[in-house]
């Protein structure tokens, strides 16, 4: 069944003398593997022999033997699906029909492939898009219906005979569907490419020319224009005439409309290639161009700047910047419409000519209040001198000047007084709108620039005010010089540095932190009694009787201030010791007797020792010695010793008499 054989390959292959041909081919024989393959050139079926006649280019048999002369033709296929062939080199007389005679065990098939071999390399074919427009990227394609592994070729693009700078992408196809070599070139044509010759050149591996295809590019573009003007420099005076001509150097397709524009705006009723301007005025100065349109769009010429010359117009002054801040820089610009531009300027300040100022700009690097006023100017060019315009006002702004803080009170000011201050200044621009005071306090401002301090403190030393507009100017601080009685009076012990012991030399100092006025007097007092009028109170040898509460007073012309009471403490060893007896120095036996060691000591006695009439110490160490029950044997003289941190003291002897009770006497 012949329908079992399915072949796929290009219908026709193209080559030229001396090149090669590669025939991609696949097949399918359903009944088994290929057993025999013959490649015929122009095969014809012979009905008599039931075989094909024709030149056998290639033959493979079951034993696999191939005649040596068949090396030009190669069967690159296999026994079940690949039937690819190669002929290298290929000759002109190979043109015609190739017949692939295939035989399997039970089936036979003849497959025909057309081969077209030309005498010389045939040209590639350039494919262009249907329309090419300037600045729009296009792809030029060069296609050659040839590709063969054994014969490398290259396609090169030329523009006007010169290799094109743009990189081309070359691709090849050697498939059962198609055989070709293709080069694609992307480029953005400009209007000047219109009419230019593009060539795709086929070359061999060594770059030798084989053939080419050529096209002339048809690039659609907006009209390209040149503008000509008489006079050529486009500089005229008022009343002169000007002619402008618009030339179309290229347009594709043909142009349809013409118009003229001045400063980007279309001029009415000007639709020819010539623009005639008669008796021009200065208003006709500007940038002119012609615009010509075609189906692609409008094209514009370069602009011609028409300058109509005239004498300067009345000038105006522009100030950068007003109001100006004192100390800043200011620039004045004299503006006057004129053509040609003014060459000389005269400047006026408050109507008076400013000497040495002849430039368009006046620059004042450091503005001062006196620079304020009206500035005007006059411009001059070759055609004449302009008029002085209205001028511009320079407002110079500055912080308040000569700010002072003034005390309104009679002097001196005493602590607790109400003080009124005012903030004064000499001049200000803009006006003063507020005031500030230092230091800040909960003070009244009864009116703008006035400060009232109720119950002024002793420590209100200085006050400063600021007058403020856009800026604040501070006055120098003013001293209130508040007078007050001495402050922080206190007693301070100068010597000894440690605690005071009886017999020490002692100095007490009367201290105070401040006093205004400074001249002061001192007074020392103990228990309401005046002791001295010096800043120091001295004791050559202190005695416990000097202990007590001391105060010192400091006074000035404003008043006097007392210190807190200061306690003078004198430390001494126990003294004036005596032994007291309770209930008395005569006690009946069996009763209770308490002996107490009384003393005067600072600090108090910390340790007591009791002695009997034999100066024998008793095992008792408290202040009281309790004898209970008392015995007659306890009779005798007793004394005590007291000890503190300063020293020891002893009492004189005190005699205790213990007498017999009536019971004892009764027993006797």
């Amino acid at each position: 069944d012949s329908s079992k054989w399915v072949f796929e390959h290009p219908e026709t292959l193209y080559a030229w003398e001396g090149a090669c041909v590669w025939i991609p081919c696949t097949y399918r024989a359903l009944d088994g593997d290929l057993e025999s393959f013959i490649l015929f050139h122009n095969p014809e079926y012979n009905k008599n022999t039931s075989k094909f006649d024709g030149t056998r280019l290639y033959e493979s048999t079951k034993d696999g033997k191939v005649p040596s002369e068949q090396k030009r033709v190669q069967f690159l296929g296999d026994k079940n699906k690949n039937c690819t062939l190669s002929i290298h080199p290929v000759h002109l007389n190979d043109s015609g029909q190739l017949g692939l005679r295939m035989e399997s065990k039970t089936e036979k098939w003849m497959e025909r492939i057309h081969l077209n071999v030309s005498e010389r390399p045939f040209p590639p074919h350039i494919q262009l898009p249907p329309e090419i427009q300037e600045s729009q990227e296009v792809t030029l394609t060069c296609l050659l219906n040839f590709s063969c592994y054994g014969y490398p070729i290259q396609l090169q693009w030329l523009l006007e005979g010169v290799p094109m700078r743009q990189a081309a992408v070359t691709s090849t196809s050697l498939t059962i569907k198609s055989v070709f070599t293709r080069s694609e070139l992307k480029f953005s044509p400009q209007w000047s490419h219109h009419g230019k010759i593009v060539t795709c050149q086929l070359q061999d591996a060594d770059g030798k020319f084989l053939s080419n295809d050529t096209v002339q590019l048809n690039v659609k573009h907006t009209p390209k224009l040149e503008i000509k003007v008489t006079p050529s420099d486009a500089i005229v005076r008022e009343g002169d005439s000007v002619t402008m001509t618009c030339e179309v150097s290229s347009s594709n397709p043909e142009y349809t409309t013409v118009s003229w524009l001045k400063d980007g705006t279309s001029l009415k009723k000007q639709n020819t290639f010539t623009l005639n301007l008669r008796e021009v005025t200065k208003d006709q100065s500007g940038k002119y161009c012609c615009q010509v349109s075609n189906d692609v769009g409008p094209g514009r010429s370069e602009e011609v700047f028409l300058q109509v010359q005239y004498a300067p117009e009345p000038s105006t002054v522009q100030i950068l910047h007003s109001p100006a801040v004192e100390g800043s820089q200011v620039e004045f610009l004299c503006m006057s419409l004129a053509n040609p531009l003014p060459t000389n300027y005269t400047w006026y300040h408050n109507g008076k000519e400013m000497q040495g100022r002849t430039e368009e700009k006046v620059h004042i690097p450091k503005i001062l209040p006196w620079h304020a006023g009206t500035y005007s100017c006059v411009a001059e060019n070759i055609l004449g001198t302009g008029q002085r315009g209205p001028g511009a006002e320079l407002d110079v702004q500055y912080p308040p000047k000569k700010v002072t803080t003034v005390i309104q009170n009679p002097m001196p000011i005493r602590e607790g007084d109400t003080v009124t201050l005012s903030c004064n200044y000499n001049s200000s621009n803009p006006s003063v709108t507020r005031y500030e005071w230092k230091p800040h306090g909960a003070w009244e401002e009864p009116s703008l620039g006035v400060l009232k301090i109720q119950n002024v403190g002793w420590d209100n030393t200085t006050i400063a005010c600021a007058a403020c507009n856009s800026w604040c100017s501070w006055a120098s601080p003013v001293a209130l010089n508040v007078q007050y009685a001495p402050r922080d009076v206190r007693v301070r012990k100068i010597k000894p540095l440690s605690e005071i012991h009886s017999g020490n030399s002692v100095s007490l100092q009367c201290d105070f932190s401040s006093s205004h006025p400074k001249e002061v007097q001192f007074f020392w007092e103990k228990n309401g009694r005046l002791l001295g009028k010096e800043s120091q109170l001295n004791f050559d040898s202190i005695s416990p009787e000097d202990a007590g509460s001391y105060s010192c007073w400091v006074n000035n012309s404003i008043g006097q201030t007392a210190s807190k009471a200061w306690t003078l403490e004198v430390l001494y060893a126990p003294r004036r010791l005596r032994v007291s007896m309770s209930p008395g120095d005569q006690v009946m036996e069996g009763k209770s007797a308490t002996l107490t060691c009384e003393s005067d000591a600072n600090p108090p006695v910390s340790h007591y020792t009791w002695f009997d009439w034999n100066n024998q110490s008793l095992p008792y160490h408290s202040q009281k010695l309790r004898l209970e029950p008392v015995k007659v044997q306890h009779s005798g003289a007793y004394w005590c010793q007291g000890t503190n941190s300063v020293g020891k003291g002893r009492s004189p002897l005190s005699t205790l008499t213990v007498y017999y009770s009536p019971e004892t006497i009764g027993r006797r």
């Epitope: 040209p123 262009l128 249907p130 523009l159 006007e160 005979g161 010169v162 000047s192 490419h193 219109h194 009419g195 230019k196 010759i197 060539t199 295809d213 050529t214 096209v215 002339q216 048809n218 390209k224 040149e226 030339e247 150097s249 290229s250």
Partner: antibody, heavy 116, light 112 residues
């Protein structure tokens, strides 16, 4: 070699039309534009327009766009120029020409005489 | 269109003399892609089509005697015949082909 062979001389009356031909050989006809140039007696050469045989695109000198029609028959490698509404000032020699990158090829010219 | 103005209109020189003729373009004919000036010079004798002498402003066509030379760039071009021969009597045209085609008015060369 490249050759442009033009049709023979023509005599026409004012108001009539004329169609002259230019047969190209020796190159691929569709690869190059074909221009028409005329020269009136004692006058300068005057470009009339061209055709791109590849796509029949034409472009004309503004002076001729209403009266001249350029066409091409690629199968015959021939270009044609028809001029209508003839007037006496159309009396001239009409040339077809084409440019290659480094040269120009001109036909021998067709003489048109317009006379009543 | 680009306008070409030739000067002088005509000139008469003795054989062997050097002659120059000018062609001024209203716009540049320099093509930026290859830096060539798209200007050609032709010689035309009565009853003959124009004969190409120079292309790209300065390249001599093969077969043209080397006494013919072209120069210039942009908008101003010159054709020089270094030693005029009797057979050089003709009208010489300049031709721009950068954009469409335009021709100069021609310069007529005569021998005294």
């Amino acid at each position: 070699q490249v050759q442009l062979v033009q049709s023979g001389a023509e005599v026409k009356k004012p108001g009539a039309s004329v169609k002259m031909s230019c047969k190209a050989s020796g190159y691929t006809f569709t690869s190059y534009w074909l221009h028409w140039v005329r020269q009136a007696p004692g006058q300068r050469l005057e470009w009339m327009g061209y055709i791109n045989p590849r796509n029949d695109y034409t472009e004309y000198n503004q002076n001729f766009k209403d009266r001249a029609t350029i066409t091409a028959d690629t199968s015959a490698s021939t270009a044609y120029m028809e001029l209508s509404s003839l007037r006496s000032e159309d009396t001239a020699v009409y040339y077809c020409a084409r440019r290659d990158i480094t040269t120009f090829y001109w036909g021998q010219g067709t003489t048109l005489t317009v006379s009543s | 269109d680009i306008v070409l103005t030739q000067s002088p209109d005509s000139l008469a020189v003795s054989a062997g003399e050097r002659v120059t003729m000018n062609c001024k373009s209203s716009q540049s004919v320099l093509y930026s892609a290859n830096h060539k000036n798209y200007l050609a010079w032709y010689q035309q004798k009565p009853g003959q089509p124009p004969k190409l002498l120079i292309y790209w402003a300065s390249t001599r066509e093969s077969g043209v005697p080397d006494r013919f030379s072209g120069s210039g760039s942009g908008t101003d071009f010159t054709l020089t015949i270094s030693s005029v021969q009797a057979e050089d009597v003709a009208i010489y045209y300049c031709h721009q082909y950068l954009s469409s085609w335009t021709f100069g008015g021609g310069t007529k060369l005569e021998i005294k």
